[in-house]
Interface confidence: low
């Protein structure tokens, strides 16, 4: 039975040209995390594998940095980066847990750095 829950940074906004940290945290389970996938819509951004370490997809290697922890740092943000991001935790023996983050990249300097809404 899957008892865990994913906590995320929720809905966040950032300025064009800036950076943002996407973070998820898996709690309430003793399952072993074997891998975390970071995806944007249907595109794979990065993977952190417990045994093999980090891999950044080639098309994102100039703008994506691993960490902190199992999180992901997006750099040189553009308006096109606006959208849904998913952290997919592969665990044993529970299976797969998925968290969702919505990022809005704003043109102006009114963007808040950090969570604007919190997803429970």
């Amino acid at each position: 039975m899957m008892t865990g829950t994913i906590e995320t940074t929720g809905n966040i906004s950032a300025e064009k040209g800036g950076s943002i940290i996407l973070q998820c945290h898996l709690s309430s389970t003793t399952a072993q995390v074997t891998q975390v996938n970071w995806e944007q819509q249907d595109q794979l951004l990065a993977i952190c594998n417990a045994d093999l370490g980090w891999h950044i997809s080639p098309s994102f290697k100039d703008r994506v940095a691993p960490g902190p922890g199992l999180g992901l740092t997006l750099q040189s943000l553009t308006v096109n980066d606006t959208g849904e991001y998913f952290c997919i935790y592969h665990t044993y023996p529970d299976g797969t847990y998925t968290g969702r983050i919505f990022l809005e990249v704003l043109e102006s300097s009114v963007a808040e750095h950090g969570a604007r809404f919190q997803i429970p």
Epitope: N49, L52, H55, S57
Partner: nanobody, 122 residues
Framework: EVQLVESGGGLVQPGGSLRLSCAAS????????MGWFRQAPGKEREFVAA????????YYADSVKGRFTISADNSKNTAYLQMNSLKPEDTAVYYC???????????????WGQGTLVTVSS
Amino acid sequence: EVQLVESGGGLVQPGGSLRLSCAASGPTLGSYVMGWFRQAPGKEREFVAAISGSGDDTYYADSVKGRFTISADNSKNTAYLQMNSLKPEDTAVYYCARWREFPGYYFAIDVWGQGTLVTVSS
């Protein structure tokens, strides 16, 4: 849905050999990397070995280098782990796994086998 079925485990004396097999029920080899992990009692699951879909690249944990050999037969959709000079510390449940293949790196484990027990004891 692809399933992985391991076989070949059992009881063997220290210094002995075993050959594990991992049969895939659907097309796996060629576009995927196949690998082996193991989990000893009371310990975390650890990487053992992997082989690229082409068979050109193999990877081994330091603890098994020179003793274990991974291979694959694309025509049979089967991966193998030849284990020689077995030690008591090799005792574990051995799991077969499948990766999606990325250029230069191997990730995204999406299918696990159920495991086969290897016991090394005199």
